[in-house]
Interface confidence: medium
């Protein structure tokens, strides 16, 4: 029974919440509690709340030493003081493009044509006024409405022929039938153009420019065009730098660089000709070898100018 | 942080006179300011305070009617509304010890004296 | 409106003794914010303890604030001759039952 340990009254502190534990006694203690904290052992929070500011059927809650508000939808600020301005929110409190009207505690929507309710959210119905053909079928639409119309009839009201009908438009051109007059429109697929779409558009003699690059031939076809490429071009437009290099023409190692319409092969040392496919005479050696090399490398453009035919198919 | 107040002087009664407690080193909107006088050789009489965010006044049940509190971003003002010899004592800014909370007062003023005679 | 009473208007204390002001509220002061102030002649206030039992910063520890509810206690220990002073409690009620604050009415402290 000796050997238990003397009770000491401040180790370890009882006092919690950050409060200080001060020795009253041999077996007293008092502690000291930080701000917001009360209790023996500070272990109860203060309610802060007692005259609180929160305003506007704000609802205090409790902190330590502090308080929070917690606001009703249409107010903000530390004390609910401030009003929301539900204009300025995301998505906008007046639907459908209704005009907002901040009010204190509130908000006000005025709506466009066709919409109605607080917040316009709600369609009004055209329909309920329309005056589509019998046989056709109201469609309510926002402050409209459209008429579907039964095969053969057209218009706003569908209370006209569908000049459609007799497949006016060629070469496969889309035909609408005009809403106020019941005449048909077609729409031109390209290469094509007029009234009923069978005119040939000349892509060739157009003002803006040659659709051919590179100064290929402009070649005018039935709905189209065709360009006739200058040697080292290809594509539909002339538009591609054939690369003459891809056929690997340089032989013995040498570099090939690719040229419009041709290409140059880079000779290894000892090597000379187009393709490089020569050897240089044996006969010559040391500096008049280096000497060689370097002369065929300065005038390669002399020497190596070499040449790919490109056929053109029409 | 400091507190100080001005525009007392000597009046006569009725004469409406405008305190004013210019504040430096703390915003008013996170601190409470009372106003609190002392008339001379009496206690310490608590006018009205100015709360913090809300702005909302208190005054005390005996001042109701015959001070009126105010605040800009750096001032908290004081007005006797019509002054009697009553109101003669020194007039003191006191600040809010807690954000938010009345509480205490950990900061005053030096106070300004206003003097009440015909 | 809420009233705290300070009992004596004066008490009178030898230097290293013991002085010990009480003031009664009128009606349970909010959260025990009950604050205790040391004001010498042409000097403001000065703020000692407050929630009725903290020290201010830089005050000596030899003040100690006690009570609860509507009874309070500052006690000065080992007074020394700059403690001649008069004291205010000062606490803060319900504003919505009356006045928010309210001062005691001062004990002088005299230092024989």
């Known amino acids: 029974a000796g050997s238990d340990s003397p009770y000491v009254p401040c180790a370890p502190s009882p006092c919690v919440n950050g409060g200080t534990c001060r020795q009253t006694g041999d077996f007293t203690f008092e502690c000291n509690c930080l701000p917001g904290f009360e209790g023996s052992t500070c272990e109860r929070n203060i309610d802060d709340c007692p005259n609180h500011r929160c305003q506007n059927g704000g609802v205090c809650v409790d902190g330590v030493n502090t308080y929070n508000c917690r606001c009703p939808p249409q107010w903000t600020g530390q004390f609910c003081t401030e009003d929301v301005d539900e204009c300025l929110l995301q998505p906008n409190a007046c639907q459908n493009g209704g005009t907002c009207t901040n009010r204190n505690g509130g908000y006000g929507c005025v709506c466009v044509n066709g919409w109605s309710g607080d917040d316009c959210s709600e369609n009004i119905d055209d329909c309920a006024y329309a005056s589509c053909t019998p046989g056709s079928t109201c469609i309510d639409r926002v402050a409209s409405f459209s008429c579907l119309c039964p095969e053969g009839k057209a218009g706003l009201l569908c209370h006209l022929d569908d000049a459609c009908i007799s497949n006016p438009c060629h070469k496969g051109a889309l035909c609408d039938t005009n809403p106020l007059n019941g005449q048909y429109i077609c729409t031109c697929p390209q290469g094509y153009k007029g009234a009923d779409c069978t005119e040939d558009v000349d892509e060739c003699a157009m003002a803006n420019s040659n659709p051919c690059e590179h100064a290929g031939k402009c070649v005018n076809t039935d709905g189209a065009f065709h360009c006739e490429c200058l040697k080292g071009y290809a594509g539909p437009r002339c538009e591609m730098d054939i690369n003459e290099c891809h056929s690997d023409p340089c032989q013995n190692d040498a570099t090939c660089l690719d040229k419009i319409g041709g290409f140059t092969c880079l000779c290894m040392p000892g090597f000379k000709g187009v393709h490089c496919e020569l050897e240089v005479n044996e006969g010559n050696s040391g500096l008049n070898d280096i000497f060689e090399a370097q002369k065929i490398e300065w005038h390669e453009n002399l020497y190596f100018q070499g040449h790919h035919h490109h056929h053109h198919h029409h | 942080q400091s507190v100080e107040e001005s525009g007392g002087r000597l009046v006569t009664p009725g004469t409406p006179l405008t305190l004013t407690c210019t504040v430096s080193?703390?915003?008013?909107?996170?601190?409470?300011m009372s106003w609190v006088r002392q008339a001379p050789g009496k206690g310490l009489e608590w006018i009205g305070i100015?709360?913090?965010?809300?702005?909302t006044l208190f005054y005390a049940s005996w001042a109701k009617g015959r001070f009126t509190i105010s605040k800009t971003s750096t001032t908290v003002d004081l007005k006797i509304t019509s002054p009697t010899t009553e109101d003669t004592a020194t007039y003191f800014c006191?600040?809010?010890?807690?954000?938010?909370?009345?509480?205490?007062?950990?900061?005053w003023g030096p106070g300004t004296l206003v003097t009440v005679s015909s | 409106a809420q009233v705290l009473t300070q009992t004596a208007s004066s008490v009178s204390a030898a230097v290293g003794g013991t002085v010990t002001i009480n003031c009664q509220a009128s009606?349970?002061?909010?959260?025990?914010?009950l604050a205790w102030y040391q004001q010498k002649p042409g000097q403001p206030p000065k703020l000692l303890m407050y929630g009725a039992s903290t020290l201010e910063s830089g005050v000596s520890s030899r003040f100690k604030g006690s009570g609860s509810g509507t009874q309070f206690t500052l006690t000065i220990s080992g007074v020394q001759c700059d403690d001649a002073a008069t004291y205010y409690c000062q606490g803060e009620f319900l504003c919505s039952s009356g006045d928010c604050v309210a001062f005691g009415g001062g004990t002088k402290v005299e230092i024989k």
């Open positions: 100015i709360q913090a965010g809300s702005n």
């Open positions: 006191a600040r809010g010890g807690v954000i938010f909370i009345i509480g205490h007062f950990n900061l």
């Open positions: 080193g703390f915003s008013l909107s996170s601190y409470d």
């Open positions: 009606q349970s002061v909010v959260n025990n914010r």
